[in-house]
Interface confidence: low
């Protein structure tokens, strides 16, 4: 019998996928001590099972559970930084500000975090060729299930203030379809957060139009406050210079606007 | 249809060494676990060494450290050296592959070593 | 080491009856279910039946089944047929991680 596969549109399972999943469990387990208890051959146990011999567009949240389960993680709720679309500068920010935490930070963003995977229906092979496009093929994919899971979990643990750090440089500074607008602002809870903050990050060095009056900031004010939930937003000029002064905050010049 | 066989049985003398081959046909080897199992004659089964074809990592059975090493020569083809065989170590030795490294679900037929003066 | 034994053997059992093979580890298998059973028959390599202590492999005929966890585990053969004649084995694994196979259990069909 010849090896046929499903073609799906998106890239195949990252190489080495298992090995990855499993070797960054262990460095993250090492490294923050309050998850020193996780086993970590039972989380792989469990995200294996939440996609293997599967349908690749039948997944549900429901198939992750077991892996949130053994995931399961207490970050500081007024610590948590929300981002859409500029992934990178949000995870420099949290690595110099460590008392604030991205998705990415926590156990099961940081063993997801920039890895594809799939499985096949019936069989016990991870299929290394191809995965679901969530636009081409389907939305209850393996990986897009996955996020949209673990985000509205984050998301519903957040409290007091929330940061979230937007990219300037879009046209859609506030994208609806985005993780963060379809998920996460959805599920903040408004008994608990009192204030959602975003960071608008401008990219051009000589950009200093007020990007908090761009219509889809508008629109996410819009969103927020009818949900009782605050609204502030700030302009992030010199991202560069921002970071900066995260590091070293009595600098001079960190006293003018970034 | 997915396949493996086992090459290099032979007869050997004591102290000797050999090399048996693991060939995958009609399938390569991606992030599966290929290990070797042996059986001596009228006995039951024993765990050798496995080797992760993704990464490269290997593992063996505490008595085969040292005298037995499984490495992964291209896609489909894995090896197990083997030094310093006593007539202890006759058996039937088979491949064997696994999606993950916990359980066998892939048999090569196996192939004879026999250690003899 | 881990030690795997199992008991009875050998096993005889009448065409259309039910055995039943026990498997205990001197220690709990890893996460208490990773542990695998296989036929295997004269001049053949090992044929995997159930994996994860309960679950059937593809192929595999449903009247072999499987239960345990930690140190004890059990196969049953339900409505035995002569087919069914061979040796079974159990196997291990630890989180080491290591792999250890039982003795084996010869069963003989009358």
């Known amino acids: 019998v010849p090896r046929w596969r499903q073609q799906w549109s998106g890239p195949g399972t990252t190489k080495r996928f298992p090995e990855t999943v499993l070797a960054r469990c262990v460095k993250y387990t090492e490294i923050h001590p309050e998850m020193r208890h996780v086993d970590c051959q039972s989380v792989w146990d469990a995200f294996k099972g939440a996609f293997i011999s599967k349908h690749p567009c039948n997944i549900t949240e429901e198939d992750y559970q077991p892996l949130m389960k053994l995931g399961t993680q207490t970050v500081p709720c007024n610590k948590i930084l929300l981002w859409s679309r500029i992934k990178d500068l949000a995870h420099q920010f949290t690595q110099v500000q460590r008392d604030m935490f991205t998705l990415e930070d926590t156990l099961l963003g940081y063993l997801a975090d920039d890895l594809t995977w799939c499985g096949e229906f019936n069989t016990s092979k991870i299929n290394y060729q191809s995965c679901p496009d969530w636009r081409k093929d389907c939305s209850n994919n393996p990986v897009s299930v996955f996020w949209k899971t673990v985000s509205r979990r984050f998301a519903e643990a957040a409290c007091d203030v929330v940061h979230v750090m937007l990219n300037g440089s879009r046209s859609k500074i506030f994208d609806k379809n985005s993780t963060f607008g379809s998920v996460e602002v959805h599920n903040l809870q408004p008994e608990k957060v009192q204030t959602l903050e975003a960071w608008v990050i401008h990219g051009g060095r000589e950009d200093s139009r007020d990007l908090c009056q761009d219509p889809t900031i508008k629109e996410l004010e819009s969103i927020i406050s009818k949900r009782n939930i605050q609204f502030s937003c700030k302009n992030i000029y010199r991202p560069d210079k921002f970071l900066q002064c995260v590091k070293n905050p009595e600098d001079s010049s960190c006293t003018s606007e970034i | 249809q997915e396949q493996l066989e086992e090459s290099g049985g032979d007869l050997v003398k004591p102290e000797g060494s050999l090399t048996l081959t693991c060939t995958a046909s009609?399938?390569?080897?991606?992030?599966?676990?290929i290990c070797w199992v042996r059986q001596a004659p009228g006995k039951g089964l024993e765990w050798i060494a496995c080797i992760y074809a993704g990464s490269g990592n290997t593992y063996y059975a505490s008595w085969a450290k040292g005298r037995f090493s499984i490495s992964k020569t291209s896609s489909t083809t894995v090896t197990l050296q083997m030094t310093s065989l006593t007539v202890a170590d006759t058996a039937t030795y088979f491949c064997?592959?696994?999606?993950?490294?916990?359980?066998?679900?892939?048999w090569g037929p196996g192939t004879l070593v026999t250690v003899s003066s | 080491a881990q030690v795997l034994t199992q008991t009875p053997s050998p096993v005889s059992a009448a065409v259309g009856g039910t055995v039943t093979i026990n498997c205990q580890a001197s220690?709990?298998?890893?996460?208490?279910?990773?542990l695998a059973w296989y036929q295997q028959k004269p001049g053949q390599p090992p044929k995997l039946l159930i994996y994860?202590?309960?679950n059937l492999a593809s192929g595999v005929p449903s009247r072999f089944s499987a239960s345990g966890s930690g140190t004890q585990f059990t196969l049953t053969i339900s409505e035995v047929q002569s087919d069914d004649a061979a040796t079974y084995y159990c196997?291990?694994?630890?989180?080491?991680?290591?792999?250890?196979f039982g003795g084996g259990t010869e069963v003989v069909v009358k």
């Open positions: 009609g399938f390569s080897f991606s992030n599966d676990a």
């Open positions: 220690q709990s298998v890893y996460n208490n279910n990773y």
């Open positions: 064997a592959s696994a999606d993950t490294i916990d359980y066998f679900n892939l």
């Open positions: 994860r202590a309960s």
């Open positions: 196997q291990a694994y630890y989180r080491d991680p290591t792999t250890a």
